[in-house]
């Protein structure tokens, strides 16, 4: 790879925990998306909260390591948890510059693979997503 991985960086107000330390923020001015150059991986992530028909970005940034899913060229989110009734957290990992800016599509809530109502679930090594 010729360059260090660069991802979109965003943390919604009120989000607990920060991934800012996983990279170096680029000085991009105000009108551009904030960008972060990853320190420990070549992998970006994104987290969206889907409530009814509205998806709201919660976090975007660098992963702390290269893991399964990081080889994806695009952000294809999968459901990860139910932080509250009627809302679902979707996360993606991907391995190209700024690939976490947008998702390609969100599966409809309740589609196969969506965690049940027994509370938040995380795949092994994905506890970072639960720090919301």
């Amino acid at each position: 790879p010729p360059n260090r991985r660069t991802c979109v960086f965003f943390e919604a107000p009120g989000v607990r925990g920060s991934t800012k330390t996983l990279g170096e923020l680029l000085d991009t001015g105000t009108e551009l998306p904030r960008a972060i150059r990853c320190l420990y991986s070549r992998c970006c992530f994104g987290i969206w909260n889907l409530t009814q028909d509205r998806a709201q970005v919660e976090m975007q940034g660098c992963r702390d390591s290269d893991e399964p899913g990081c080889e994806s060229l695009h952000c294809d989110p999968s459901p990860r948890a139910h932080p509250s009734p009627g809302s679902t957290l979707f996360t993606c990992s991907c391995g190209t510059d700024f690939c976490n800016a947008n998702y390609s599509h969100l599966p409809p809530p309740g589609s196969p693979g969506t965690p049940g109502s027994q509370g938040p679930q995380a795949a092994p090594g994905e506890s970072i997503w639960m720090a919301l």
Partner: antibody, heavy 113, light 112 residues
Framework: QVQLVQSGAEVKKPGASVKVSCKAS????????VSWVRQAPGQGLEWMGE????????NFNEKFKGRVTMTTDTSTSTAYMELRSLRSDDTAVYYC??????WGQGTLVTVSS | DVVMTQSPLSLPVTLGQPASISCRSS???????????LEWFQQRPGQSPRRLIY???NRFSGVPDRFSGSGSGTDFTLKISRVEAEDVGVYYC?????????FGQGTKLEIK
Amino acid sequence: QVQLVQSGAEVKKPGASVKVSCKASGYTFTDYWVSWVRQAPGQGLEWMGEIYPKNGVSNFNEKFKGRVTMTTDTSTSTAYMELRSLRSDDTAVYYCARQRDYWGQGTLVTVSS
Amino acid sequence: DVVMTQSPLSLPVTLGQPASISCRSSQSLEYGDGYTYLEWFQQRPGQSPRRLIYGVSNRFSGVPDRFSGSGSGTDFTLKISRVEAEDVGVYYCFQATHDPNTFGQGTKLEIK
């Protein structure tokens, strides 16, 4: 095939500005960083910075901060590098490159009173 | 800034003989993601630079296999197994691990 074609030579007076263009073809312009590198006469190469055309995010050499602006026009697959407050030691060949793998032919900028 | 120091600065070589260029960085070029962002460029007289090697040892497409790169940390080497006439020019190492990215001062390869 990948090609980067730069604008022609420029002669500028000290204090003026210059804007060099770099038209890309043969690849998806928005998928690669465009780097800018300069080379003073008989000297080595100096990295100036880079820009990601898809969103305009750029990363500069601090040495040029405040004097350089890098922009892109995705509709024409063209990158631009503007250098302001020119001095005689800005006389150099300015190169654009696609993430440093394919390079333009260079643009000679001469700063002279 | 990270200083890239090349040696020798001038390299006279006989055609068909091997050549070796050293590049030392003032800081380690191994990044936190495990990669080392070290590249080598060739600049023939009157031409634009051309990438030969990226990631220390990966040959760029179209580069003859007589060119090879090696090294780690702060010490890197570009080797040409058998020098040909078309190899004449200046060779630069380059690091993209630290900002600002920096080039070595160049090594001029000429035929004896």
